[in-house]
Every structure is written in structure tokens, then in C-alpha cells.
Interface confidence: low
Amino acid sequence: SRGQYSREDNNCTHFPVGQSHMLLELRTAFSQVKTFFQTKDQLDNILLTDSLMQDFKGYLGCQALSEMIQFYLVEVMPQAEKHGPEIKEHLNSLGEKLKTLRMRLRRCHRFLPCENKSKAVEQVKSDFNKLQDQGVYKAMNEFDIFINCIEAYMMIKMKS
Amino acid sequence: SRGQYSREDNNCTHFPVGQSHMLLELRTAFSQVKTFFQTKDQLDNILLTDSLMQDFKGYLGCQALSEMIQFYLVEVMPQAEKHGPEIKEHLNSLGEKLKTLRMRLRRCHRFLPCENKSKAVEQVKSDFNKLQDQGVYKAMNEFDIFINCIEAYMMIKMKS
């Protein structure tokens, strides 16, 4: 059997400490622009509702976080930057901190697993392509191993 | 605050029972073609190694399952079908069972979370677009709520 590759969970052991610091940095960066947008926001309804928090705390947490970071970086901040060079500067700083957070979360795989590809699957695909015709026979012959994998996955999902 | 929408976790409570049945159906369907591909497979090395099983059992389990189902449906089976009408018929049946499994897993969100979008995020994006300019102000004004969401997510990830 192929040797296990390293997961490169660097920055994971000391992550809880760094996490508080990163969130504090985000809050500080946001405080630079909060008053400006507070004044501009004329509507009473809430955009980021309890439903969103529940998704963050549930089994869709990773997707919610990943999509919301992308949403702020791609859709919100570029439009918000149009309010002058000073606001743009602060938003750039906020955006960079958000990107840094995402990068660190990605590096420590268990924090953003939905953004990581399975290396083992990549290896299967690579081997499959190298084997040409024999790859099809082998993959089909081993379909029962695949069923065992599905079973193992589902067992864990039922326990979690 | 907007009312919570239903998660539509239909088929989840009785899923453990259905799961065994679905896997048994997959195994039975595979048994129809196993001998054929066993004879054709001339290589000793294993394609689906323990590394794959470990990814299925780890935090990349959902990605591994999602990618492997796609791999078999799109890359392996269409090539394997070329071995005559009888094999093609059995493989169609096997493929349908695999698609049914995926569909049921998707329906019970916690089993394939990586293939599900956060409905709360979709709602945020929809509301944001409806609000036009005010959406930008609101989204930026509520950035601290977003930070709270990130914090909640990370706390859960550190506990798990």
C-alpha cells in the first residue's frame, strides 16, 4: 500500500492562540470603517440573520465560511471601495486580513476542509490515467473497495 | 429576524436502515460484473489504497466521496461500457444505484455537506442584490456579525 503522505497541518497546534489575534485584527481593521457604513445604512432589517450563524455552527459551516469570505472579497468590498481613497485604503487592509485568515485556515486543513481536495483521490486518478486500458479494469475490479470506503464514510457520518 | 427555514432533512432519521440496503444493492449490482473485470485486471498493484480509505474516514471524507462517485460515473464506467451490451446494461444499473445513493446522501445534508450550498448564504446574497446600493452599506455595517460567525465556527472546529 502506498505510504501515507503528510497532511502538512502546519500552524495547527498553536492555532487557537493565533486565532484570537487574527479575529482581534479583523475587528480593529473593521472599526476604522464601521462609523462610515453605519451612517450610510438606512435600513432596519438585518442582512446577516440568525440563520447564517446557525449554518456557521452546523454541518454547512465550512461552506458558509468559504462562501461568505468570497462574498465579501468579491461582491461587497469592491463596491464599497468606491467611496473614496481613504475608505478604499481601510477596506484593502480589512480585505488583506480576511485573505490572511483564509490562507491560515486552509493551511490547517481541518478548519477549511471543504476547500481542500483529497490527495488520495488525486493519486487514484493519476494512477488510473497512467494505466490506460488496464486502469478501467482495475478501477472496476476494485469497485467493492470503493463500496467499503462509502460504508466507512457513512458510519462516521452517522456517529458524528 | 427572518424565520428559520426547514433543513428538509427528509430520510435522515431512518437513514441508517436505508443505508445498509443501498450498499447491499450496490454490492449485488457489482457482483454481476465483478468476474468479468477480475479476469481482465492483469495487474497486481492496488489502485484504491488505504490512503483513500483514510481520506474517506477523515476530514476530507466528503470531498473524497463526492470526487470518487464523479470519477466512477464520468471516467470509469463510460469506458467500461464499451465491452458489449450485456456489460453496458449491468453498468447502467450499477451507475443508477450510485446516482440514487448520491441523491439520498445529498437530501440528508449532513451526509454530503460539501455538495450542499448554505441556504442562509444564498439568502444573504439574494437580499444583498435586492437592496442594491443599500446592500453594500448594510453588508459592511454588519461585518462584525460576520466576524462573530467566523469566531463561532472556529470555536466548534477547535472543539471537534
Epitope: 466507512a152 458510519m155 | 480509505m53
Partner: antibody
Framework: EVQLVESGGGLVRPGGSLRLSCTAS????????MAWVRQSPDKGLEWVAS????????YYRDSVRGRFTISRNNAKTTLYLQMDSLRSEDTATFYC????????????WGQGVMVTVSS | DIQMTQSPSLLSASVGDRVTLNCKTS??????LAWYQQKLREPPKLLIF???PLQAGIPSRFSGSGSGTDFTLTITSLQPEDVATYFC????????FGPGTKLELK
């Protein structure tokens, strides 16, 4: 300090009922899955039932399914096991246990409570 | 169901000895195995999870190894307070426990 304290055990006739309770302290109860495990001299340790942290899902061993009901009250930080149609083979010490986060090993156990089913 | 066997069922050893307890499963469970210590009239206490990591607060003389179907719990230098019954527990498929190894002093 994590503490799990069981109560409600005792002697009951075959076919009778008992309700076990487990009061938790020293940790955030709603953050953990909980389970009941029993131990008898003849069968050793046996997992009985589990419940998810928000009580959405419950799981039972085959021999107790339909007779036992696991439940929890997060506000009261209490886990329950309602046991009906008791049989002599249910005689055991019942332990309240905690699942660590989303993992599945049992990291803390209560002192246990004795359940005797006999005529 | 996954069957579990432990050997030996009874082990007599002296203080300071290196002690090895074995656990075997009927199928591959990878590293989904925990070890517990149970003293007389006490509940089981978690020592090891995921085959080798030591639970917080457990002395470093305890260590776990193995994966697949064969697992080992080692006590490098036996202490009087280690007299107990030791159970292995698999959580790969369902939840089952080994029958236990009773460890006593010679």
C-alpha cells in the same frame, strides 16, 4: 472538573420499567454527544444508546431498540434512559458517558448505577 | 459486528516491569481504537484514543500502538496503582469493547 452522576437504578421485575438520569456538570453539556454503556459480569461492556448534542438523532443497540429511549434536556444538563419491558439480561451497571466533540470515543464516564431485573 | 479479543486475559507482573497488553479485532479498524483502565468498583477511565494519543492527565508510562487489526497497550514501568482491568474499544463500525485484561501484581 467533569462530573457525570447517574441515578434511578434499582430492583425491578421482568417486564417492568425504570428511568435512569444522569446529571452533568463541569462542561458545556450541549456541546457533547452522550451515550449509555452497561457492564455485566457475563457480557462485559456493551454500548446501549447514543444521542447527538442537540437531540436530533438517537441510536440504539439492536437488543434494546423499541424498549429503551434515550433523551436529554440541555437546559437541565441531564441525560435520560427510559427502560421499558425489562428483561433479566438487562441486569447490569449502567454508565452515563460523554462523546468527545465530533469524535466517537468515550472520554468521561459516570460512577454507574446498578439495575437488577429479577422476579 | 466487529469481534474483539484481548490477550492475555490475566497478567501477573512486578513493580517496575514493562508490561504489554494486546487487542485484536476481527476486521481492519485503522486507528479507531481506545484503551480504558478500570479499577475495582470504579468506572472505566480513558487512557488512549485513536490507537496512540494519550488522554490529558494520563502518565507517560502508558503508550498505545498499532493499526488495522492488532493493537498494543504498553506500560513501561509498572506501578502499584496500575493494578486494574484494561479494556480496548473500537468505534470504527458500531461500538464494541474487548473482554478485558486483568493486571495484577506478582
Amino acid at each position: 472538573e467533569v462530573q457525570l452522576v447517574e441515578s434511578g437504578g434499582g430492583l425491578v421485575r421482568p417486564g417492568g420499567s425504570l428511568r435512569l438520569s444522569c446529571t452533568a456538570s463541569g462542561f458545556t453539556f450541549s456541546d457533547y454527544h452522550m451515550a449509555w454503556v452497561r457492564q455485566s459480569p457475563d457480557k462485559g461492556l456493551e454500548w446501549v444508546a447514543s444521542i447527538t448534542l442537540d437531540a436530533t438523532y438517537t441510536y440504539y443497540r439492536d437488543s434494546v431498540r423499541g424498549r429503551f429511549t434515550i433523551s436529554r434536556n440541555n437546559a437541565k444538563t441531564t441525560l435520560y434512559l427510559q427502560m421499558d419491558s425489562l428483561r433479566s439480561e438487562d441486569t447490569a451497571t449502567f454508565y452515563c458517558t460523554r462523546h468527545r466533540g465530533f469524535s466517537v470515543w468515550l472520554d468521561y464516564w459516570g460512577q454507574g448505577v446498578m439495575v437488577t431485573v429479577s422476579s | 459486528d466487529i469481534q474483539m479479543t484481548q490477550s492475555p486475559s490475566l497478567l501477573s507482573a512486578s513493580v517496575g516491569d514493562r508490561v504489554t497488553l494486546n487487542c485484536k479485532t476481527s476486521q481492519n479498524i485503522f486507528e479507531n481504537l481506545a484503551w480504558y483502565q478500570q479499577k475495582l468498583r470504579e468506572p472505566p477511565k480513558l487512557l488512549i484514543f485513536n490507537a496512540s494519543p494519550l488522554q490529558a492527565g494520563i502518565p507517560s508510562r502508558f503508550s498505545g500502538s498499532g493499526s488495522g487489526t492488532d493493537f498494543t497497550l504498553t506500560i513501561t514501568s509498572l506501578q502499584p496503582e496500575d493494578v486494574a482491568t484494561y479494556f480496548c474499544h473500537q468505534y470504527y463500525s458500531g461500538y464494541t469493547f474487548g473482554p478485558g485484561t486483568k493486571l495484577e501484581l506478582k
